[in-house]
Interface confidence: low
């Protein structure tokens, strides 16, 4: 027999199948051109000294063989003696070491057995009712296919699944979606309705993330507020990387988890933008305001669970930066200005009500005045800081108020609102004899003392009613007692106390009359 034709004789070996586990398998035959055909197969086991014979039986019952030697692939034409228009049965017999091993048979019409391509190009992946939907363009001239998929996770081996018959210009497959692990999928196709025809190769891997992106396990730290009024937010611990199946390691698209940082500035609620989202790599500078920081993990199916942290406000206060002048028309604050065209946010909140929303006001962009100061004024009618209580004031600045990460803290301080002069007047002034020429004056702390840094000092005034001589005694803001010495017995005195702030002289308390009794010797 010639080498290019199927030999209608008995093969040159005994045809008993040894039934071993090794041998030829996965035979597939298909048309490769208008008149050309190819069969190929796998051989399991040692290949030394193995001779392969492709066997073919026609529908008439006549059988022939091609001897391929050690090759596991054979090409032949429609002139090789094998009927290509009618059903034939093909198998491989491999002869080695006086044994013959036989592959499973395939029965097909060679002319109709076209080698199908796997899904090519872009395989679109989406989520549909808790399942995974894959969709792709049907390869040219190959409408009508059976499709299979196989999938694996990082810890499991391949599992086979069926996509069902396809008969359109686009093909699709519903596959299982894992909640918490990434998967690798591959797809293959074969001609619809020809069970004996061969499967295409497997497609390139399709890498699919878990339905839920992993919870971002990260930790933050925030630096001290710098002299520029900003502090750096730093990432202490990177998010853990998702474990990937073998074919998805390396630059496999589709399984990426992106982490984004969502900043919510809780302070200064009247500003234009409260929330800003940044890539996690872009660790921002923050003002001294309070923030909520969320890390959002997203994959191709959208955002997943997020983790939120609260960054408390930096409450370090500046004792001297703010000047406040109270006039008949209202109140004006002055502080060292930032650059040209800066917007300021002035926020105030009664001390002890930190849980509630602060009140604030956004200034128009302003330039420094000739003295290098910025100002904010309000009238008494506005009601701003109008109650006689302690307020915490924070001033933030930005040349770009809409960009959340460009705010900085100018100062943080306290202010006593309303008529601080009157409200701060010390009460319960009492005088006690101390010695023959001195008395001890005590008073209840001023309301101003509840406001850190506001009370500059107490002043105690003593007037000699006989001579009208007045002496004033400054007292530290932490003290509520003073001793008046060098007093004369029998003289009437009045004593008053006032509480002063850095910008305001307090109102005197009610005069308290006293005298030191003249000591009569026995």
């Amino acid at each position: 027999c010639g080498t290019s034709e199927c030999c209608f004789q008995d093969p040159p070996y005994s045809d008993a199948d040894s039934g071993s586990a090794s041998g030829p398998r996965d035979l597939s035959c298909y048309r490769i051109s208008s008149a050309g055909y190819e069969c190929s197969w796998q051989y399991e086991g040692p290949t030394a000294g193995v001779s392969h014979f492709l066997r073919c039986c026609l529908s008439s019952g006549r059988c022939c063989y091609f001897a391929t030697g050690s090759a596991t692939r054979l090409q032949f034409s429609d002139q090789a003696g094998v009927s290509v228009l009618h059903t034939v049965t093909l198998w491989v017999e491999s002869w080695a070491r006086n044994r013959t091993e036989k592959s499973p048979e395939v029965t097909l019409q060679l002319y109709k057995s076209v080698k199908y391509k796997p899904p090519l190009g872009d395989i679109k992946v989406s989520k549909l009712a808790g399942q995974l939907r894959m969709e792709w363009e049907t390869p040219d001239n190959q409408v009508g296919a059976e499709v299979q998929f196989r999938h694996r996770t990082p810890s499991s081996s391949w599992k086979l699944g069926d996509c069902g018959p396809q008969d359109d210009d686009t093909e699709s497959c519903l596959c299982p979606l894992e909640m918490n692990v990434a998967q690798e999928f591959q797809l293959r196709r074969r001609r619809l309705g020809s069970q004996g025809s061969s499967w295409s190769k497997w497609s390139s891997p399709v890498c699919v993330p878990p339905e839920n992106p992993p919870q971002p396990q990260v930790r933050f730290s925030v630096e001290q507020l710098g002299r520029d009024g900003r502090r750096r937010l730093t990432l202490k611990e990177q998010p853990t990387q998702l474990e990937l199946p073998e074919g998805c390691q390396g630059p496999a698209p589709g399984v990426e988890v992106t982490y984004q940082l969502q900043l919510h500035m809780l302070s200064c609620p009247c500003k234009a933008k409260a929330t800003r989202t940044l890539p996690l790599e872009k660790m921002p500078y923050l003002s001294g305001a309070a923030y909520n920081v969320a890390v959002i993990s997203s994959n191709r199916f959208g955002p997943g669970p997020n983790q939120t942290w609260h960054i408390p406000a930096d409450t370090h206060t500046e004792p001297v930066a703010l000047n406040i002048s109270v006039g008949t028309n209202g109140t004006t604050m002055y502080w060292p200005a930032r650059a040209q065209s800066t917007t300021y946010c002035i926020e105030w909140q009664p001390v002890g009500q930190e849980g509630s929303l602060a009140t604030c006001n956004l200034t128009a962009p302003q330039d420094p005045d000739p003295a290098g100061m910025a100002t904010y004024s309000w009238s008494r009618e506005s009601g701003a800081m109008g109650q006689e209580k302690c307020y915490h004031i924070t001033i933030f600045a930005s040349a770009h108020p809409k960009k959340l990460t460009l705010w900085s803290t100018v100062l943080s301080t306290y202010h006593f609102g309303g008529n601080a002069s009157a409200a701060g007047t010390p009460h319960h002034v009492s005088v006690k004899n101390h010695s023959l020429d001195s008395v001890s004056v005590d008073w209840a702390p001023s309301l101003l003392s509840t406001c850190p840094g506001v009370l500059k000092e107490y002043v105690v005034r003593c007037r000699d009613e006989d001579s009208n001589q007045v002496s004033e005694h400054p007292v530290q803001p932490t003290e509520t007692q003073v001793t008046l010495s060098d007093l004369r017995a029998g003289v009437a005195y009045t004593v008053q106390v006032r509480a002063d702030t850095a910008w305001l002289r307090g109102a005197w308390s009610q005069p308290q009359r006293f005298s030191i009794k003249v000591q009569v010797s026995d």
């Epitope: 969502q262 997203s298 959208g302 770009h400 809409k402």
Partner: antibody, heavy 121, light 107 residues
């Protein structure tokens, strides 16, 4: 690849309504702010409205405030523009455009091909 | 609303020329400015964002500069495919506004 496909345009009489849609694909729609920008025939570009990734923030041009409503359906990857009380000066090609961030404080990195709205009696 | 004024409104140039288009904002907008290219019948294409950052995929012959109120788009060596209309856009404050456009034509 990122694709934005507008639909819903057509000829409409003054005073009537029209709803434009923009179908988004090729990116995680839920992670981006979106806007509508229009261009009257032979004229320049005009920003119409914008919406943040989660619809918590919507903004409008003064010329359409109170008449147009921007919205999104993240489950359908679709952006909408509901246009009521249409006027002749609303005649334009309407483009759907993506912001490169969750919010809309930025330029627009991807645009659709546009859909023509003609308001005429 | 912030007004954006582009100049010139049109210009004629030859392949290889250096072309400069300016955009002025009616108030300071920091660097919140984008430049777009639009060809007839097509959607605009982002070239520059944040006044000077080149959008990925855009040739390096395009560059942007400026901050505050005055901005410039420069094409270092004009190519045949660069003949189009160019727009600037501010995104500093709502409503976002575009310049009226600069048409770059073949000389």
């Amino acid at each position: 690849q990122v694709q934005l496909v507008e639909s819903g345009g057509g000829v409409v009489q003054p005073g009537r309504s029209l709803r434009l849609s923009c179908a988004a694909s090729g990116f995680t729609f839920t992670s981006y702010g979106m806007s509508w920008v229009r261009q009257a025939p032979g004229k320049g570009l005009e920003w119409v409205a914008g919406i943040s990734y989660d619809a918590s923030d919507t903004e409008y041009a003064d010329s359409v405030k109170g008449r147009f409503t921007i919205s999104r359906d993240n489950s359908k990857n679709t952006l909408y523009l509901q246009m009521n009380s249409l006027r002749a000066e609303d005649t334009a090609v309407y483009y759907c455009a993506r912001s490169p961030d969750y919010i809309i404080d930025y330029g627009f990195d991807y645009w659709g091909r546009g859909t023509l709205v003609t308001v005429s009696s | 609303a912030i007004q954006m004024t582009q100049s010139p409104s049109s210009l004629s140039a030859s392949v290889g020329d250096r072309v400069t288009i300016t955009c002025r904002a009616s108030q300071g907008i920091s660097s919140d400015l984008a430049w777009y290219q639009q060809k007839p019948g097509k959607a605009p294409k982002l070239l520059i964002y944040d006044a000077s950052s080149l959008q990925s995929g855009v040739p390096s012959r395009f560059s942007g500069s400026g901050s505050g109120t005055d901005f410039t788009l420069t094409i270092s060596s004009l190519q045949p495919e660069d003949f189009a209309t160019y727009y600037c856009q501010q995104y500093w404050w709502y409503p976002f506004t575009f310049g009226q456009g600069t048409k770059v034509e073949i000389k």
